[in-house]
């Protein structure tokens, strides 16, 4: 069925209409839209009370609604693909006519968690209970329905129409009937405010056709924000009743003449307006003409007024409303300026902090200052930033370049720096030699020594350690430890065996690789290599070979 029975309540600058009819939310919105409105908003407790009043009016006219729990669509919807958001008062829903999210809500129960389906909100009315201002209709969300299938218990909908202003209802000074026709095609004979552009038809008399006079008026904007009918004096006056009928149609006082005629008057502090019926305060500020936080200030002799704005705001072109002053236009800050309602604030770029001479000044943050350095080793402060550096033998590492990582010179890009064995240490390295060889005074080369079946010669003393210089010596083998049966480290080299610059054979005794003294308490394996090969030495015999084949991917075994 379509929408039929309707009720109307006009208040402030809006009218609300309630309609019965089992329509989907889209059909209901379309119905409101055709007359220039939208499904109603309920953005505050006050608005909820207006909507409740129009629903109460509708329910008084409706004979019998089919469900005890009836639902009426309002203009709160969540589009397909938009998820429920529990952190917001409107839970991710928004008003169909647009407008900002508002803090007021009145949800019936916890909302169904969904994203895929479009969801719509209706007001839930328990028809077994009287509608009380203290018990406002709850919001119920659900599917939006479809033509012919509006959804369970949907009995109607509420529309809202907004206007630039309202006229007071016409005052009748004698018997008669007023019929208002609104721009949204509703006719009513009792409105507490009548929207701009409404027509009023006044039929005077007591129903006796011979005595009936008709008047036609339009609610017009007489001056900015001033709306009236353009009528003068009370309508349908009758000497028979004088002031006794509806106070003669007067807003405040009614004065009768001896001949049955009468005039309207006003109480002290008020004046009679051009319609000769309505009274307005002599104080022009009493009608609160100023908006947006502006204060009304009376002019001399109380005749006119001006609006005054709080600090940080200025009057707009209407001279009635306050708008924020954008203080950032004057560039009051050294770096970033953020305009705020009624003011502004200065902010500093990353790497700077508030401080220095002058308002809104910024000064460099010394990231390298004691206790706040983000660098593992060296830190250099720069204007607005910083950079990290590492001691010799370390390189910058980490995603943000603040960490230092030991350079393993034994497997470095320039190749190993030692002629034979290489022991990496934190920030440095040491060279060593195979059995039967001794470390030369340069700490890098190996020279033939007395034949020995002992372990390889350990690292040189500190003063003999290899200098950290680039080298073009090609890399040979890197040994990688494994655990022996007794849990002792056992060298298992993972690259090609070394070539030695002498014909002397490598002894067949297994090599025991020793962690050099002064190295950290972790096993570091040597790298076995040599720059040139004069002749190929014999393959070592026996159990633990100190040499293994190269990885098939061409890489060295990891430490």
């Amino acid at each position: 069925t379509g929408a039929d029975t309707e009720a109307v309540v006009c208040v402030g600058t809006a009218c609300y209409t309630a309609h019965s009819g089992k329509l989907s939310a889209a059909e209901a919105q379309n119905h409101c839209n055709q007359n220039g409105g939208n499904l109603a908003t309920v953005k505050s407790k006050e608005e909820a009370q207006h909507v409740q009043r129009v629903l109460a009016q509708l329910l008084r006219r409706e004979a019998a609604l089919t469900a005890r729990m009836s639902k009426f669509w309002i203009g709160l919807q969540r589009e397909k693909g938009k998820c429920l958001d529990p952190s917001l008062p409107l839970k991710g829903f928004s008003w169909v006519g647009g407008g900002e999210d508002t803090p007021y809500s009145n949800w019936h129960k916890e909302l169904r968690n969904s994203c895929i389906s479009k969801r719509c909100v209706s007001l839930l009315l328990d028809l077994s209970q009287p509608l009380l201002p203290s018990r406002l209709p709850k919001w119920s969300e659900g599917p939006c329905g479809s033509p012919g299938s509006p959804g369970s218990n949907i009995e109607g909908f509420v529309c809202k129409f907004s206007f630039k202003g309202m006229c007071r209802p016409l005052a009748l000074g004698g018997p008669g009937q007023v019929t208002y026709t609104t721009p949204f095609q509703t006719t009513s004979s009792s409105l507490e405010a009548v929207p701009f552009a409404s027509a009023a038809n006044v039929a005077c008399g007591e129903g006796d056709k011979d005595e009936t006079q008709s008047h036609y008026f339009l609610c017009k904007e007489k001056a900015p924000d001033v709306f009236d009918w353009g009528s003068s004096g009370p309508l349908c006056v009758s000497p028979k009743y004088g002031c006794n009928f509806n106070n003669g149609g007067c807003h405040q006082d009614c004065f009768e003449g001896g001949d049955g005629s009468f005039l309207c008057g006003c109480r002290p502090g008020f004046r009679l307006l051009d319609d000769l019926v309505t009274c307005a305060s002599r104080n022009p500020c009493s009608s609160s003409p100023c908006r947006g936080g502006a204060t009304c200030v009376l002019g001399p002799h109380g005749k006119n007024y001006t609006c005054r704005c709080p600090q940080g705001y200025q009057l707009d072109s209407s001279q009635l409303d306050c708008v924020d002053v954008d203080e950032c236009q004057d560039s009051p800050c050294a770096q970033e300026c953020v305009n705020t309602p009624g003011g502004f604030r200065c902010e500093c770029w990353v790497g700077y902090e508030p401080g220095g001479p002058g308002e809104g000044a910024c000064q460099d943050v010394d990231e390298c200052a004691l206790g706040r350095s983000p660098c593992a080793q060296g830190c250099t402060n720069t204007d607005g930033s910083f950079h990290c550096s590492c001691e010799e033998g370390y390189v910058l590492a980490g995603e943000d370049g603040t960490q230092c990582q030991d350079v393993d010179e034994c497997v470095g890009p320039g190749g190993p720096l030692c002629d034979s064995l290489c022991f990496n240490t934190q920030g440095s390295f040491h060279c060593g030699c195979l059995p039967g060889w001794v470390l030369a005074p340069n700490g890098v080369s190996c020279t033939m020594g007395p034949v020995s079946l002992g372990p390889p010669s350990g690292p040189p003393d500190e003063e003999d350690k290899g200098e950290k210089e680039g080298s073009t010596v090609p890399r040979a083998a890197t040994a990688s430890p494994t655990r022996g049966p007794e849990g002792t480290p056992k060298a298992t080299p993972t690259t090609s065996r070394p070539s030695l610059s002498s014909d002397a054979p490598i002894t067949s005794a297994p090599l025991k690789m020793l962690a050099p003294s002064g190295s950290p308490g972790v096993w570091r394996e040597p790298s076995i290599h040599h720059a040139t090969a004069a002749s190929g030495p014999q393959e070592p015999a026996g159990g633990d070979s100190s040499v293994a084949t190269q990885n098939n991917d061409g890489t060295d075994g990891q430490k």
Epitope: G81, D85, N113, S114, C115, I116
Partner: antibody, heavy 120, light 108 residues
Framework: QVQLVQSGAEMVKPGASVKISCKAS????????MHWVRQTPVYGLEWIGG????????AYNQNFKGRVTMTRDTSISTAYMELSRLTSDDTAVYYC?????????????WGQGTLVTVSS | EIVLTQSPATLSLSPGERATLSCRAS???????LHWYQQKSGASPRLLIY???NLAFGIPARFSGSGSGTDYTLTISSLEAEDVAVYYC?????????FGGGTKVEIK
């Protein structure tokens, strides 16, 4: 507790269709949306689409539009995902999943997965 | 559609080390709609962190998440053997939902 139990592995020929089921238990079936995600070695995890069991409304990934159909049978708390015109690229593990009482599409519950192999 | 790029592809760390996984979006994502999943070998994905920084039920406190806009991070403060898995980020800011390519975390 919430459980999502999927139908068994499928071997299908190129050009054919496959229909996988996902039976829900431990909650009111119409309360939570049901989504389908697949996993392949090449493309990783891909969202196929989802269905709102209360209304039957669906949302599909455009990449599967025209080939995928999601349905549900509320009487047996089961969701279905049918994919047609299969190619070898559709060989994957298919999961049904939903976000239970969590918000913002954080998929809290997952089925055990259904391996679909497309091979001639 | 929003593309999520995860790095590194593989992360090899020793037990007790801190793991930092990155997820970068091709355009801004609401922090409410960015989630992390853990998938162990042969298992279904498991929700780890939802809405950028909230631990899912039963997830140990060594996992944490942070980020906003286009850059998000999953951190494992002290890696344990049981954390060996592939970790995925996922976002929603309109259909389709998308997942990152994953970061494989392994023990050195």
């Amino acid at each position: 507790q919430v459980q999502l139990v999927q139908s068994g592995a499928e071997m299908v020929k190129p050009g054919a269709s496959v229909k996988i089921s996902c039976k829900a238990s431990g909650y009111t079936f119409t309360d939570y949306e049901m989504h389908w995600v697949r996993q392949t070695p090449v493309y990783g995890l891909e969202w196929i689409g989802g269905i709102d069991p209360e209304t039957g409304d669906t949302a599909y990934n455009q990449n599967f539009k025209g080939r995928v159909t999601m349905t549900r049978d509320t009487s047996i708390s089961t969701a279905y995902m049918e994919l047609s015109r299969l190619t070898s690229d559709d060989t994957a593990v298919y999961y049904c999943t939903n976000y239970g009482n969590l918000y913002y599409y954080a998929m809290d519950y997952w089925g055990q997965g259904t391996l679909v192999t497309v091979s001639s | 559609e929003i593309v999520l790029t995860q790095s590194p592809a593989t992360l090899s760390l020793s037990p007790g080390e801190r793991a930092t996984l990155s997820c970068r979006a091709s355009s801004s994502v609401s922090s409410s709609y960015l989630h992390w999943y853990q998938q162990k070998s042969g298992a279904s994905p498991r929700l780890l962190i939802y809405s950028t920084s909230n631990l899912a039920f039963g997830i140990p406190a060594r996992f944490s998440g942070s980020g906003s806009g286009t850059d998000y991070t999953l951190t494992i403060s002290s890696l344990e053997a049981e954390d060996v898995a592939v970790y995925y980020c996922q976002q929603y800011s309109g259909y389709p939902l998308t997942f990152g390519g994953g970061t494989k975390v392994e023990i050195k």
